[in-house]
């Protein structure tokens, strides 16, 4: 499955929403910076691609989720907001077109569903983190920079994909 | 390869105007802040402020706030540390180095190789 | 602003021998400090960084430990390339402060 040139324009559009949606001067947060155990490993490039359409599928499920709760709402300007899940339901959409298509439909393998959980564990320590910090301005800047990072990340390995074929 | 590459040594004369630069390659450069540390001969490290290139974002530390302007041009991924009107006192090494902001990565893990600036009469 | 103090501002040592050096913070900083080396004429040089992780590529002999207000960086055995000055900085709050210094001498 090709996911369409359009998919990783999308991605570098919601790296530029993430961006914009910032709120404070992010200088007065340094003190609310914290480990989330980013699970850069489930994204290496000895993945095959069956392997990682799921994965990839699962981060972009979680930031939408992240970003779709009541706080997300109050935290961030409405109209950036909606932009960003525009663009993520788009890209859920590329990648959902490419199981359908039959990429991961075999036995998922083992180390798939490890990945998977991998994901979801590291954004239930962003979520407990936000609940910690009562879901305050700093806290949810903090975690708009992770999820840059990550996100960034998961986009490389969709980039490195691409140039493999 | 991450690099900081900073503009070469510099000679003024008291009252003149002076700008350095900044060059970062090999990583996304609006991604990490960058802070200016001042050495003076035979003295410790300085911290003297720091930028946000994603929208130029500026703090400075209170001995420096006023005296020295940091700004950033992010379509040349280059940071500069100006002043208006040089002093002798203003003689040192500058260095410039990256931070990762607000994410969880080794602070300020690349520096610039230091800008020596002589102001002499 | 964060005063950080260390102790000693020099020392002299031999290779082989385990320095200690130490940095205090006027207030707690969490772990948001960081430890520098800088040899003459040289930028400075990250070595350990959020107080206890060791920065890539840096020798295993380097280790750092502490949180709050006293923080300690240990080189186990002093080889002929650690001779240099070391530096403590708080990354907690703006405006980041450094320590004076810890010049590693030969004895």
């Known amino acids: 499955c090709d996911l369409p040139q359009t998919h990783s324009l999308g991605s570098r559009r919601t790296l530029m929403l993430l961006a914009q949606m910032r709120r404070i001067s992010l200088f007065s947060c340094l003190k609310d910076r914290h480990d989330f155990g980013f699970p850069q490993e489930e994204f290496g490039n000895q993945f095959q691609k069956a392997e990682t359409i799921p994965v990839l599928h699962e981060m972009i499920q979680q930031i939408f989720n992240l970003f779709s709760t009541k706080d997300s709402s109050a935290a961030w300007d409405e109209t950036l907001l909606d932009k960003f899940y525009t663009e993520l339901y788009q890209q859920l959409n590329d990648l959902e077109a490419c199981v359908i298509q039959g990429v991961g439909v075999t036995e998922t393998p083992l180390m798939k569903e490890d990945s998977i959980l991998a994901v979801r564990k590291y954004f239930q320590r962003i979520t407990l983190y936000l609940k910690e910090k009562k879901y305050s301005p700093c806290a949810w800047e903090v975690v708009r920079a992770e999820i840059m990072r990550s996100f960034s990340l998961s986009t490389n390995l969709q980039e490195s994909l691409r140039s493999k074929e | 390869e991450v690099q900081l590459v900073q503009s070469g040594a510099e000679v003024k004369k008291p009252g003149e105007s002076l700008k350095i630069s900044c060059k970062g390659s090999?990583?996304?450069?609006?991604?990490?802040?960058i802070g200016w540390v001042r050495q003076m001969p035979g003295k410790g490290l300085e911290w003297m402020g720091i930028?946000?290139?994603?929208?130029?974002?500026?703090a400075y530390s209170p001995s420096f706030q006023g005296q020295v302007t940091i700004s950033a041009d992010k379509s040349i991924s280059t940071a500069y540390l100006q002043w208006s009107s040089l002093k002798a006192s203003d003689t040192a090494m500058y260095y410039c180095?990256?931070?990762?902001?607000?994410?969880?990565?080794?602070?300020?893990?690349?520096w610039g190789q230091g800008t020596l600036v002589t102001v002499s009469s | 602003d964060i005063q950080m103090t260390q102790s000693p501002s020099s020392l002299s040592a031999s290779v082989g021998d385990r320095v200690t050096i130490t940095c205090r913070a006027s207030q707690s900083i969490s772990k948001f400090l960081n430890w520098y080396q800088q040899k003459p004429g040289k930028a400075p040089k990250l070595l350990i960084y959020?107080?206890?992780s060791l920065q890539s590529g840096v020798p295993s002999r380097f280790s750092g430990s502490g949180s709050g207000t006293d923080f300690t960086l240990t080189i186990s055995s002093l080889q002929p390339e650690d001779f240099a000055t070391y530096y403590c900085q708080q990354s907690n709050t703006l405006p980041f402060t450094f320590g004076q210094g810890t010049k590693v001498e030969i004895k």
């Open positions: 180095a990256r931070h990762p902001g607000l994410n969880w990565a080794p602070d300020f893990d690349y």
């Open positions: 959020f107080a206890s």
């Open positions: 930028i946000d290139p994603s929208d130029s974002d500026t």
């Open positions: 090999g990583y996304s450069f609006t991604s990490y802040w």
